[in-house]
């Protein structure tokens, strides 16, 4: 799997999973975000050669093709595959509110 | 949506359904399929600006970031939604058989 | 363990191109980002630029114009390319990690290389 | 640029000392700041990051805080291999910027 484990520990110029922190006031401006301050959000990015990870046939095909006609730009694009969600700390007024934003982080990574 | 009714009648340079035909042979160098000669598979390219198209939170967050870095190269990727299969004819022998291959045809795309 | 380690001249002419290397272990180029910072004698430190794990650049706007930073990811080594060198470039310059890419603090330094620009 | 104002540029104390080190930022920098010791020859060690998160290994004696634009940096009892020039750092904005270092030294 394209995921922390493996490409945490590799160099790998291919779709991987690469960290990410990513602060919420400073680069995406949601000051209404108590907790936490930011998280490590991840990304997937790298080449998609042929069979790397392929996520369909299609993706399979595509790369094939790419590899053939290249110019086309036409190849699988590297894309995250497994998230899990991220609990956040807000205020409504005076209230607390804790809630679980699904799809937050980044878990592994696939060519689509 | 990002499909062929949308995307092949706009000139849009965000993600969007691009089509692509496939010849087996020549372009995949594929022998074995006898019918058909090649199909119509499509792909998904084009930018992914903040909110254009976004899968997840994840990619919703991603595209934000990317505006504000975008030498980071964490940009959401436009990649295949909906795909469809292939109905295809192939021979073991002389007995022909007709084969569904899934996911062989892009319907529409998304950022994610 | 993590180590950086620049090399490159110590002595520099004006007006010469320098050209300094960081050589990293126990971490891949393509998972964390390397930042060039230098401090010139007795004086603060100043961030020069960075290279992204994606391979992407980030300078400081007062060094734009003569700065490239470049990597070579299955040596694992950074290089910085500085033109146009003045006797005030007279520096220890430091490549530098940060703990999570965008976190943007530095968790792990070379030992540092004092460049002298001098005739 | 985020100009960062470091004081005082030098400070006189003994061991046993509380020290504090001040740093002013010239915006908000919503708690994006790190603090390093450096020692002569040797390149700068992180204390401090995210102004109050204690970097790993790094003595409990140290501790960060903020006030508004001004962030702190506390050593509550100087110990002798705390003798040492502190640098605070500004990690919110390109380019990330330094202040002119503080110089702890011997009473």
């Known amino acids: 799997a394209l995921d922390a484990a493996y490409c945490f520990r590799n160099v790998q110029d291919n779709c991987c999973l690469r960290p990410l922190y990513i602060d919420f006031k400073r680069d995406l401006g949601w000051k209404w975000i108590h907790e936490p301050k930011g998280y490590n959000a991840n990304f997937c990015a790298g080449a998609c050669p042929y069979l790397w990870s392929s996520d369909t046939q299609h993706s399979r095909v595509l790369s094939l093709y790419n590899t053939i006609n290249p110019e086309a730009s036409a190849s699988p694009c590297c894309v995250s595959q497994d998230l899990e969600p991220l609990t956040i700390l807000y205020y409504i007024g005076k209230t607390p509110k804790i809630e679980q934003l699904s799809n937050m982080i980044v878990k592994s990574c696939k060519c689509s | 949506a990002l499909d062929a009714a949308y995307c092949f009648r706009n000139v849009q340079d965000n993600c969007c359904l691009r089509p692509l035909y496939i010849d087996f042979k020549r372009d995949l160098g594929w022998k074995w399929i006898h019918e058909p000669k090649g199909y119509n598979a499509n792909f998904c390219a084009g930018a992914c600006p903040y909110l254009w198209s976004s899968d997840t939170q994840h990619s919703r967050v991603l595209s934000l970031y990317n505006t504000i870095n975008p030498e980071a190269s964490a940009s959401p990727c436009c990649v295949s939604q909906d795909l469809e299969p292939l109905t295809i004819l192939y021979y073991i022998g002389k007995t022909p058989k007709i084969e569904q291959l899934s996911n062989m045809i892009v319907k529409s795309c998304k950022c994610s | 363990e993590v180590t950086l380690k620049e090399s490159g001249p110590v002595l520099v002419k004006p007006t010469e191109t320098l050209t300094l290397t960081c050589t990293v272990s126990g971490f891949s180029l393509t998972t964390y980002n390397v930042h060039w910072v230098r401090q010139p004698p007795g004086k603060a430190l100043e961030w020069m630029g960075l290279i992204w794990n994606t391979g992407g650049t980030r300078y400081n706007s007062a060094l734009k114009s003569r700065l490239t930073i470049s990597k070579d990811t299955s040596k694992s080594q950074v290089v910085l390319t500085m033109t146009n060198m003045d006797p005030v470039d007279t520096a220890t310059y430091y490549c530098a990690r940060d703990p999570v890419p965008n976190k943007w603090h530095f968790d792990f330094w070379g030992p540092g290389t004092l460049v002298t620009v001098s005739s | 640029d985020i100009q960062m104002t470091q004081s005082p540029s030098t400070l006189s104390a003994s061991v046993g000392d509380r020290v504090t080190i001040t740093c002013l930022a010239s915006e908000d920098i919503y708690s994006n700041l790190a603090w390093y010791q450096q020692k002569p020859g040797k390149s700068p060690k992180l204390l401090i990051y995210?102004?109050?998160s204690l970097q790993d290994g790094v003595p409990s004696r140290f501790s960060g805080s903020e006030s508004g634009p001004e962030y702190t940096l506390t050593i509550s009892s100087l110990q002798p291999d705390d003798f040492a020039t502190y640098f605070c750092?500004?990690?919110?904005?390109?380019?990330?910027?330094f202040g002119q270092g503080t110089k702890v030294e011997i009473k």
């Open positions: 995210d102004a109050r």
């Open positions: 750092q500004q990690h919110h904005a390109y380019p990330f910027t």
